[in-house]
Interface confidence: medium
């Protein structure tokens, strides 16, 4: 029998330009009579235009929902009922071509054409995009709170906040032709559940979503988003009821930035410059295409690209790259945001140079991408270190810590975390190197102690970038570096003149002058340590809860011993800046470190002094007795201590600790404690210092109290943030 043809609804969204009308502010108010009258006329014109083409037989409904500048731009959607088998034949491109063809055919015609009765439509200004029923529903839900704004060249327009009686609002933004819009979002509250979505078109079309942000993100307190052109839509969905806008939105038109460059690299190793997407750190725009051509001076070198929190991966089956597509020497790679550093190493085989292309394959974009570029020696990519093939990074080899995810940096070591004698490859402990006492058969541990040596895992790098053989030479009272830099910044790590933690003892005043108490509303929350005149270091997890994220909540006490009373040596500070490590991951506790900038510099005294920071190469030997201090609970689940407690703990080899915690211990962690438990940090000690005393008598910061299973439990050591693993970030921030 006859089978009825299946019809499907095909939704289109778009805009057209009217040359004989001008936009007026009245048209931004949906309740105005001007808006109602203009919509009625525009709607009639749109329907007549569609029905004048062979699309007429499929016409179902249409709506003009907004107007804009240019002289007058009408924004609309319409629905066609199409036989299912013709669905693909009527793509937005085909529909646009049919409508343009119709408009062009009547441009010079003297005949009366219904849709030209009032409007002179510009054929070149017609845009048709694919939409969905869901998109139209989303659009309709915002029409009660619909804001149109035109922003002129050189202007920065701050958008009026949402109407809190509405559950959803839409800002329709437009700028001058040939410019692109840059939207800036700044979260102003510590906590909220609001959702904002940015689109590369006038309405909320899911397929043209640039990005969506949610709930006063602490990771991104400020977000800048680029559209591909002069039109953009921002949709707000209400979270918790609030009388205050949890965000500030501003928009400005910016010129297109070319993203093409030809560079010739110098004949030297290390980073030589930076490549980035336009307007970095803004999100890259949906139609970004960058092409960088780099010429390498010699085939001895390869090209290294160092990324920050972004990696390149091979993508299976030609699927689109959702976080940026890269082509490097005809290899297609996809970008991936990660909470780790990453390097891509490109072997150079021809002097023609290397072309690197970056493209946003889909409208969904992400934070701008920045990459440092430089050369590496192809025959020895990581002098004195190990090249980790998993992430392209140079990592310390044979130091007892698996820095490379596959652990190969700790494989095939002749001597692990020890010094290898030249004579017979026997291994001696590092403190015995350059100590004036020959321990190797022919004394090779005492050779080259007064001269520069090739840099390696345990060598100390001086400011002039030369290296010295003596392990841990910092601040030991004798210059080992030619430039004396190992004895600079040494006003640290000395205890004041002074004669709970689980299993601990009470500290005396001035005994741990770097110890900080981080308090909220008079209540001790976390420990910390003074590392410079305006900087206190602590654990990032202290600020994990949204309610703890604001700097205004925190007071930092230094020189404190007793929680319930004050003494003259005690000082307090407000916090002007709070910086969490950019790679901090709450679930894994990785990179558990934060820096607090104090509102004014400390005045050093017997009770208030900074602790010494170790160099990246500083070796804290397993078995070493170090100390933790804090006001944390004296027993698991107990209340915090009134007196500052101190307890000695032993540093544990990474491999053992990793086994105990089922391989959740990362290279940025360090373990200390005892296998029998009893002595350990506990709740309230978080962020507090784990310090080790050097032979010079100075105390160096080895770790920060981070996590562990319970407190003082047998077999479960305390896990600390390994300071040498995050020192480069600390130095970058503090200096």
């Amino acid at each position: 029998g006859y089978k009825a043809e299946v019809m499907v609804s095909q939704v289109y969204s778009g805009s057209l330009r009217v040359l004989n009308r001008h936009f007026s502010q009245d048209l931004t108010r949906r309740e105005s009579s001007a808006f109602r009258s203009e919509t009625a006329k525009a709607q009639k014109m749109l329907k007549e235009l569609i029905t004048s083409t062979r699309l007429g037989t499929y016409y179902n409904s249409s709506s003009v929902y907004s107007f804009g500048e240019g002289p007058l731009t009408c924004f609309f959607w319409f629905i066609l009922q199409i036989p299912e088998h013709r669905r693909l034949m009527l793509s937005p491109e085909v529909v646009q071509a049919l409508l343009v063809e119709e408009l062009l055919s009547t441009v010079n015609s003297s005949a009366a054409v219904p849709y030209r009765a009032e409007y002179e439509v510009d054929p070149e200004g017609l845009v048709i995009l694919e939409a969905s029923v869901k998109d139209i529903a989303a659009l309709n839900s915002t029409l009660g709170c619909y804001r149109y704004s035109y922003v002129g060249q050189g202007q920065v327009l701050r958008l009026k906040g949402p109407d809190h009686l509405a559950s959803s609002c839409l800002w329709h933004l437009q700028g001058p032709k040939d410019l692109m819009l840059k939207l800036r979002l700044e979260w102003t509250l510590a906590e909220c559940r609001d959702r904002l979505a940015m689109y590369d078109v006038a309405g909320p079309l899911e397929k043209r979503l640039i990005t969506s942000v949610y709930g006063c993100s602490r990771q991104e307190p400020v977000v800048e988003v680029l559209a591909s052109g002069a039109i953009m839509a921002v949709v707000w969905k209400k979270g918790l009821h609030s009388y205050y806008d949890p965000f500030v939105l501003s928009v400005q038109p910016v010129v297109f930035q070319a993203c093409e460059v030809n560079l010739t690299l110098d004949n030297r190793l290390d980073s030589q410059g930076v490549l980035s997407t336009p307007y970095f750190p803004s999100y890259y725009s949906p139609q970004t295409h960058c092409s960088w051509h780099l010429t390498v001076p010699s085939l001895d070198y390869g090209l290294a690209l160092w990324f920050d929190a972004y990696a390149l991966r091979r993508q299976k089956y030609d699927l689109p790259c959702t976080q940026g597509q890269w082509t490097i020497q005809n290899r297609r790679l996809c970008g991936l945001r990660i909470l780790q550093p990453y390097a891509e190493r490109i072997p150079v085989v021809a002097t023609a140079g290397i072309t690197i292309n970056f493209t946003s394959q889909i409208s969904l974009t992400g934070p701008g991408v920045r990459v440092h570029y430089g050369l590496y020696n192809q025959s020895d990519p990581c002098p004195g270190e190990f090249l980790c093939s998993v992430n392209g990074l140079c990592v310390p080899a044979c130091d007892g810590v698996k820095d490379c995810p596959n652990g190969l940096d700790e494989r095939n070591c002749v001597c692990r975390a020890t010094f290898q004698c030249k004579e017979d490859s026997t291994c001696i402990s590092l403190p015995k190197v350059c100590d004036g006492q020959p321990d190797c058969l022919n004394g090779s541990d005492e050779e080259q102690c007064q001269e520069g040596v090739p840099c390696g895992t345990f060598t100390f790098q001086c400011e002039d970038r030369s290296c010295v053989k003596k392990p841990n030479p910092q601040c030991d009272g004798r210059p080992d570096c030619r430039d004396g830099s190992d004895e600079e910044h040494c006003d640290c790590g000395l205890q004041g003149p002074s004669s709970r933690i689980v299993g601990g003892a009470v500290s005396s005043e001035g005994e741990w002058p770097w110890q900080a108490s981080l308090q909220v509303r008079g209540r001790h929350i976390c420990g910390g340590a003074l590392i410079a005149d305006r900087w206190v270091i602590t654990a990032a997890h202290c600020f994990q809860e949204d309610s703890m994220a604001s700097t205004v909540l925190w007071t930092v006490f230094l020189g404190k011993v007793w929680q319930n009373s004050r003494w003259p040596g005690e000082v307090s500070f407000k916090v002007s800046r709070l910086l969490l490590h950019p790679y901090h991951e709450e679930d894994s506790h990785d990179y558990d470190v934060a820096l607090l900038q104090l509102d004014h510099p400390v005045v050093r005294s017997a009770a208030v002094r900074p602790v010494c920071l170790p160099a990246r190469s500083h070796f804290f030997e397993p078995g070493l007795h170090c100390w933790i201090t804090g006001w944390g609970a004296l027993r698991e689940g107990g209340p915090i201590s009134n007196a500052l407690q101190k307890v000695d703990v032993q540093l544990i080899p990474q491999d053992l600790c990793s086994e105990v915690y089922r391989y959740q211990v990362t290279p940025r962690m360090l373990c200390a404690g005892y296998r029998k438990g009893k002595k350990d940090a506990c709740q309230g000690d978080s962020g507090g210092p784990l310090v080790c005393k050097a032979l010079s008598g100075r105390w160096f910061l080895a770790g920060l109290v981070s996590w562990g299973l319970g407190c003082g439990r047998p077999n479960y050591f305390g896990v600390y943030t390994r300071i040498t693993g995050v020192i480069s970030w600390i130095q970058q921030v503090v200096t």
């Epitope: 291994c427 491999d655 296998r675 029998k676 047998p714 077999n715």
Partner: antibody
Framework: EVQLVESGGGLIQAGRSLRLSCAAS????????MYWVRQIPGKGLEWISS????????AYADSVKGRFTISRDNAKNALYLQMNSLRAEDTALYYC?????????????????WGQGTTVTVSS | QSALTQPPSASGSPGQSVTLSCTGT?????????VSWYLQHPGKAPKLMIY???KRPSGVPDRFSGSKSANTASLTVSGLQAEDEADYYC??????????FGGGTKVTVL
């Protein structure tokens, strides 16, 4: 005097079970990891099993896994090895050993006190 | 887990030095610094001589010294004495709370 004394060995038929005991004295038993190690006459030492002081980490050699069970009773200062499904190749002198003493130190995997051993002979 | 490899025998005259080797893999001796050495006189229980590659328990003479290079650990007995004649066993931690022993070396004082 620090001492470990094994008992419970003897002649046993293959497939049967036997339970070895080790009585500890002269030291704080519940602060030490304990081990069972065996030695086939005229041959080398073979680690069999270990148990931490609170019995929360237990490990076995592949050769005995699923057949032998180590346990301890800290109140009685005693270590046990329950041996099931015995085989001829289990014939050996069985030593109980204590992990090296140390002031709260981390694991040494070294045994500083040994008993004199108890002989187990499995006949097929 | 497979046993560590030790030479079956070694010998030296009184006053001389003898070095015993113990070869494992990169997963035991090569990876961990938990190599121990034991001395066993006939009919007696083993006695701990070295732990953590090179540390001596109290009461062990300093004639006994340990070292390690890559996957091989060594025990050196210098100033050999008659009472040093015995079987020597090495052991290593092998991960996952397991310990592995060597087959033993019989040392003869000539």
């Amino acid at each position: 005097e620090v001492q470990l004394v094994e008992s419970g060995g003897g002649l046993i038929q293959a497939g049967r079970s036997l339970r070895l005991s080790c009585a500890a004295s002269g030291f704080t038993f519940d602060e030490h990891v304990m081990y069972w190690v065996r030695q086939i006459p005229g041959k080398g030492l073979e680690w069999i099993s270990s148990i931490t002081w609170k019995s929360d980490i237990i490990a076995y050699a592949d050769s005995v896994k699923g057949r032998f069970t180590i346990s301890r009773d800290n109140a009685k200062n005693a270590l046990y090895l329950q041996m099931n499904s015995l085989r001829a190749e289990d014939t050996a002198l069985y030593y109980c050993a204590r992990e090296k003493d140390g002031d709260f130190y981390y694991y040494y995997f070294a045994m500083d006190v040994w008993g004199q051993g108890t002989t187990v002979t499995v006949s097929s | 887990q497979s046993a560590l490899t030790q030479p079956p025998s070694a010998s030296g005259s009184p006053g001389q030095s003898v070095t015993l080797s113990c070869t494992g893999t990169s997963s035991d001796v090569g990876y961990y610094n938990y190599v121990s050495w034991y001395l066993q006189h006939p009919g007696k229980a083993p006695k701990l001589m070295i732990y953590e590659v090179s540390k001596r328990p109290s009461g062990v003479p300093d004639r006994f010294s340990g070292s390690k290079s890559a996957n091989t650990a060594s025990l050196t007995v210098s100033g050999l004495q008659a009472e040093d004649e015995a079987d020597y066993y090495c052991s290593s931690y092998a991960g996952s709370n397991k310990v592995v022993f060597g087959g033993g070396t019989k040392v003869t004082v000539l």
